[in-house]
């Protein structure tokens, strides 16, 4: 058993049929010594008396808010949550496995630049009685500070018969050094509580590996005289790190016909313009990637040819 | 070239070679970012590689003030990785095929380090740890970890030379 926050405790249980459970001793936070009784949740049934209560925690029915009273007055509360371990593996019932980039990916994180700011998100099908708390640091043995905001519901989607809820959180490294080569990864820890179930999820990454630039901006076409060719030009996204002579991007320009089956013409360039042939009903798209480190490509920015 | 008097390197040449290094480092093992490298007996592996840290003057402002600190750090790293790529970790079993990009990568690391430090001028170099894995699978794991950290190192070096070529070239 360990304290999650004031008056909230997590009991770690090996979860299998007829498991013995854990013996837990609760102590009433009061100077009083006599006439103390204990109840669980809304029930008025007295579970025991005295300053301490010893209980055997085996299942969710044994978890909940234990309250000690004296003469009708509430003295203190202790909320017990359960953390299940099945076959040596902690349960992951609350969040959905996003399976990208690999199985058992519950948290996904992205950064738009090297400023030390990043966003993480996760998915669940649970709609109520759900709370999240997020902590982060750079490194684990001698951790350096990363400040995270509160997790918020950022999207709702319908997936077949199920509703899926996306939560996200923004974090910022306290003393970020954008030009340095990271040697210690960022660690992100999410505590999830659904009713009386506690779970924790972690992710470890370098900012460089989660970079995904915003799409190029101000994508424009300029027809070239007496030619089917056009000059495509664009700019670095506003959110990308500066100066651009240091934090450089590379670009992929694609000409795509109306039909998905049509052959795509692709050009790669480090410049912010390119000359391509504009076919009728086609569209031109440009995306960006860090020039020197193969992290994710941005989403496409597109304009029609006509 | 970075010579004892602290004059400028051939920024444009360094830019071209460092960008080539980036390409080679990724082609040497493109999947490296998606490998699950957590294995038993794997803790001590590449914690000793030189990193370009915050105080090394490799940021745009530091380069403007005095690029020598940063160039020395990059040079140390290039020599370090060049030695690792020439060691038993990469020459031992399982063997790399003759057309593996690791050979080109090794040569390019040497080429860039020589551009930064011509004959007769010696910067201090960092001690190369004696990593001599006894098992072929450990050698394989070390390769991936070394390539992964090399990818990060050469990315910073390439940014430095790109910025230098754009803003510090005479």
């Amino acid at each position: 058993i360990w304290e999650l926050k004031k008056d909230v405790y997590v009991v770690e249980l090996d979860w299998y049929p007829d498991a013995p459970g854990e013996m837990v001793v609760l102590t009433c936070d009061t100077p009083e010594e006599d006439g103390i009784t204990w109840t669980l949740d809304q029930s008025s049934e007295v579970l025991g008396s005295g300053k301490t209560l010893t209980i055997q925690v085996k299942e969710f029915g044994d978890a909940g808010q234990y309250t000690c009273h004296k003469g009708g007055e509430v003295l203190s509360h202790s909320l017990l949550l359960l953390h299940k371990k099945e076959d040596g593996i902690w349960s992951t019932d609350i969040l959905k496995d996003q399976k990208e980039p690999k199985n058992k990916t519950f948290l996904r994180c992205e950064a738009k630049n090297y400023s030390g700011r990043f966003t993480c998100w996760w998915l669940t099908t649970i709609s109520t009685d759900l709370t999240f708390s997020v902590k982060s640091s750079r490194g684990s043995s001698d951790p350096q500070g990363v400040t995270c905001g509160a997790a918020t519901l950022s999207a709702e989607r319908v997936r077949g018969d199920n509703k899926e809820y996306e939560y996200s959180v923004e974090c910022q490294e306290d003393s970020a050094c954008p030009a340095a080569e990271e040697s210690l990864p960022i660690e992100v820890m999410v505590d999830a509580v659904h009713k009386l179930k506690y779970e924790n999820y972690t992710s470890s990454f370098f900012i460089r590996d989660i970079i995904k630039p915003d799409p190029p901006k101000n994508l424009q076409l300029k027809p070239l005289k007496n030619s089917r060719q056009v000059e495509v030009s664009w700019e670095y996204p506003d959110t990308w790190s500066t100066p651009h002579s240091y934090f450089s991007l590379t670009f992929c320009v694609q000409v795509q016909g109306k039909s998905k089956r049509e052959k795509k013409d692709r050009v790669f360039t480090d410049k912010t313009s390119a000359t391509v042939i504009c076919r009728k009903n086609a569209s031109i798209s440009v995306r960006a990637q860090d020039r020197y480190y193969s992290s994710s490509w941005s989403e496409w920015a597109s304009v029609p040819c006509s | 070239r970075a010579v004892p008097g602290g004059s400028s390197p051939a920024w444009t040449q360094c830019q071209q070679l460092s960008q080539k290094l980036c390409t080679l480092a990724w082609s040497a093992h493109p999947l490296v970012g998606h490998m699950d490298l957590r294995e038993e007996g794997d803790e001590e592996t590449t914690n000793d590689v030189p990193h370009i840290q915050c105080g090394d003057g490799c940021d745009p402002q530091g380069l403007r003030d005095n690029s020598q600190f940063c160039l020395q750090r990059i040079h140390q790293g290039l020599i370090f990785y060049e030695k690792l790529l020439g060691s038993d970790i990469f020459t031992g079993e399982p063997s790399l095929l003759p057309d593996s990009p690791v050979g080109q990568l090794h040569a390019s690391l040497l080429g860039l380090s020589q551009l930064l430090q011509p004959e007769g001028h010696h910067w201090e170099t960092q001690q190369i740890p004696s990593l001599s894995p006894s098992q072929p699978w450990q050698r394989l794991l070390l390769r991936f970890k070394i390539l992964r950290s090399l990818q990060a190192f050469v990315a910073v070096a390439a940014r430095v030379f790109a910025h230098g070529a754009a803003t510090l070239s005479p």
């Epitope: - | 699950d36 079993e93 095929l97 699978w137």
Partner: antibody
């Protein structure tokens, strides 16, 4: 075509040594390793060790505690396995096999004993 | 040393029936999660062994009735429809750690 031709059968006294040769042809000798495997009569296979002429690396089965020495002569494309302090339980067929042990992006850990010698019967008897 | 335990020691199967050979390692013989350092060899009487499965991949020329599966410590070689020419002793071999070790062998015969 690839061939590994081993030296002929040997009868040895306990305490003596035996040196089995394995002449390789039909491929570039230094591009592959040579592995030695033995098989006692009616028994299973036992890996003794292997040598890679290109890297110069030799790996041994510690079970033989310094009794086995594996070498290669690049000039004649011949591998050798010497076993000393022979005892009756060393009676076995000794095989050499070509070892391909490579790493590529597609196959990061490819190991194959793809061609084998015909085997050399070593009998240890007083 | 990694100990490789094969089961069963011998197996008699009717022609056209399925034969399943198991190999259990005393330690994990996969590398970084998925790459297998476990191989299967076939040895017919009076002949040297022949590689049939390399990691998770069949060697070229090996009939597709042979299939290898497994990861971590438990591996299986399956012959989906036994043919007369499949009568042999089958060995698993791990080359994750030196010394490389073979399983004790499984003799496959026709019932």
């Amino acid at each position: 075509q690839v061939q590994l031709v081993q030296s002929g059968a040997e009868v040895k006294k306990p305490g003596s040594s035996v040196k089995v040769s394995c002449k390789a042809s039909g491929y570039t000798f230094t591009s592959y390793g040579i592995t030695w495997v033995r098989q006692a009569p009616g028994q299973g296979l036992e890996w003794m060790g292997e040598n890679y002429p290109r890297s110069g690396n030799t790996y041994y089965n510690e079970k033989f505690k310094g009794r086995v020495t594996i070498t290669a002569d690049k000039s004649t494309s011949t591998a050798y396995m010497e076993l000393s302090s022979l005892r009756s339980e060393d009676t076995a067929v000794y095989y050499c096999a070509r070892a391909e042990f490579i790493s590529t992006v597609v196959a990061p850990y490819y190991y194959a004993l793809d061609y084998w010698g015909q085997g050399t019967l070593v009998t240890v008897s007083s | 040393d990694i100990v490789m335990t094969q089961s069963p020691d011998s197996l008699a199967v009717s022609l056209g029936e399925r034969a399943t050979i198991n190999c259990k390692a005393s330690k994990k013989v996969t590398i970084y999660g998925s790459t297998s350092a476990l191989h299967w060899y076939q040895q017919k009487p009076g002949q040297p062994p022949k590689l049939i499965y390399n990691g998770a991949k069949p060697e070229s020329g090996v009939p597709d009735r042979f299939s290898g599966s497994g990861s971590g410590t438990d591996f299986t070689l399956t012959i989906s429809s036994l043919q007369a020419e499949d009568v042999a002793v089958y060995y698993c071999l791990q080359n994750k750690e030196v010394p490389y070790t073979f399983g004790g062998g499984t003799k496959v015969e026709i019932k």
